[in-house]
């Protein structure tokens, strides 16, 4: 039975040209995390594998940095980066947990962080 929950940074906004940290945290389970995938729509951004470390997809190498922790930092943001991001935790023996973050990239300096929320 999957008992874990993923807490994410929720709905967030950031300024064009700036950077933002996407964070997820898996709690309430003793399952071992074997890999975390970060995806935007259907594109793989990065992988953190417990055995081998971080791998950044070639098309994002210039704008994505690993961390902090299992999070992901997006840099040089453009309005095209607006959209849904998913952290996908592969665990043993539970299976897969997925968290969702919505990022809005704003032209102005009105960007503010949204509230945290949980996805069971």
């Amino acid at each position: 039975m999957m008992t874990g929950t993923i807490e994410t940074t929720g709905n967030i906004s950031a300024e064009k040209g700036g950077s933002i940290i996407l964070q997820c945290h898996l709690s309430s389970t003793t399952a071992q995390v074997t890999q975390v995938n970060w995806e935007q729509q259907d594109q793989l951004l990065a992988i953190c594998n417990a055995d081998l470390g971080w791998h950044i997809s070639p098309s994002f190498k210039d704008r994505v940095a690993p961390g902090p922790g299992l999070g992901l930092t997006l840099q040089s943001l453009t309005v095209n980066d607006t959209g849904e991001y998913f952290c996908i935790y592969h665990t043993y023996p539970d299976g897969t947990y997925t968290g969702r973050i919505f990022l809005e990239v704003l032209e102005s300096s009105v960007a503010e962080h949204g509230a945290r929320f949980q996805i069971p």
Epitope: C48, N49, A50, D51, G53, W54, G67
Partner: antibody
Framework: EVQLLESGGGLVQPGGSLRLSCAAS????????MTWVRQAPGKGLEWVSG????????YYADSVKGRFTISRDNSKNTLYLQMNSLRAEDTAVYYC??????????????WGQGTLVTVSS | DIQMTQSPSSLSASVGDRVTITCRAS??????LNWYQQKPGKAPKLLIY???SLQGGVPSRFSGSGSGTDFTLTISSLQPEDFATYYC?????????FGGGTKVEIK
């Protein structure tokens, strides 16, 4: 005592193929991520490829991507490197080694003695 | 890819000397930095992992420090068996990358 014994090296023509094997003993093979590292004559160390404990995740250096394939057989305690479309610049001593898990800080802790691959016409 | 720059590329020292080798990463790598010793015709040997953790069986005269982008390997009192080439290596992001090496020679 941990032992990693590489085999399968030798002389091959450009465009040819070789399959390197690495037989592991003295450790619980399935508990270790594994890697191949090479060293051209008189040069420094270059990481080639890595594979997770289960074999489900594999990573490659750009210089070998699409030409080399890493795999493992945990039932046989053996690591493999299939090398296709070999080039002169692939000439090197190839080392099989164990990777400390990234989640434990990493590091390549046990190394084989190496096997020489020479690509020449 | 992350570039690892070692300095110096070679150095001459005497037995008993304190030797320091530096390694700089082209971007942040936290403490995912390892140090190896290699002697001619032999496989490398892991000395330090995670920037400062001493690998089992390695003499305590070897130590590592640093975090982020700048790292140091120190040999507190050089012994005859320490004359070799030393490499740093990051394992934060694939591809794993090595420094160019530092050859420690007898003065």
């Amino acid at each position: 005592e941990v032992q990693l014994l590489e085999s399968g090296g030798g002389l091959v023509q450009p465009g040819g193929s070789l399959r390197l094997s690495c037989a592991a003993s003295g450790l619980t093979f399935s508990n270790y991520a594994m890697t191949w590292v090479r060293q051209a004559p008189g040069k420094g160390l270059e990481w080639v490829s890595g594979i997770s404990r289960s074999g489900g995740s594999t990573y490659y250096a750009d210089s070998v991507k699409g030409r080399f394939t890493i795999s493992r057989d945990n039932s046989k305690n053996t690591l493999y490197l299939q090398m296709n479309s070999l080039r002169a610049e692939d000439t090197a001593v190839y080392y099989c080694a164990t990777l400390r898990l990234y989640s434990s800080g990493g590091g390549i802790d046990y190394w084989g003695q190496g096997t020489l691959v020479t690509v020449s016409s | 890819d992350i570039q690892m720059t070692q300095s110096p590329s070679s150095l001459s020292a005497s037995v008993g000397d304190r030797v320091t080798i530096t390694c700089r990463a082209s971007q942040y790598i936290s403490t995912y930095l390892n140090w190896y010793q290699q002697k001619p015709g032999k496989a490398p040997k892991l000395l330090i992992y995670a920037a400062s953790s001493l690998q089992g069986g390695v003499p305590s005269r070897f130590s590592g420090s640093g975090s982020g982008t700048d790292f140091t390997l120190t040999i507190s009192s050089l012994q005859p068996e320490d004359f070799a080439t030393y490499y740093c290596q990051q394992n934060y992001i694939t591809p794993l990358t090595f420094g160019g090496g530092t050859k420690v020679e007898i003065k």
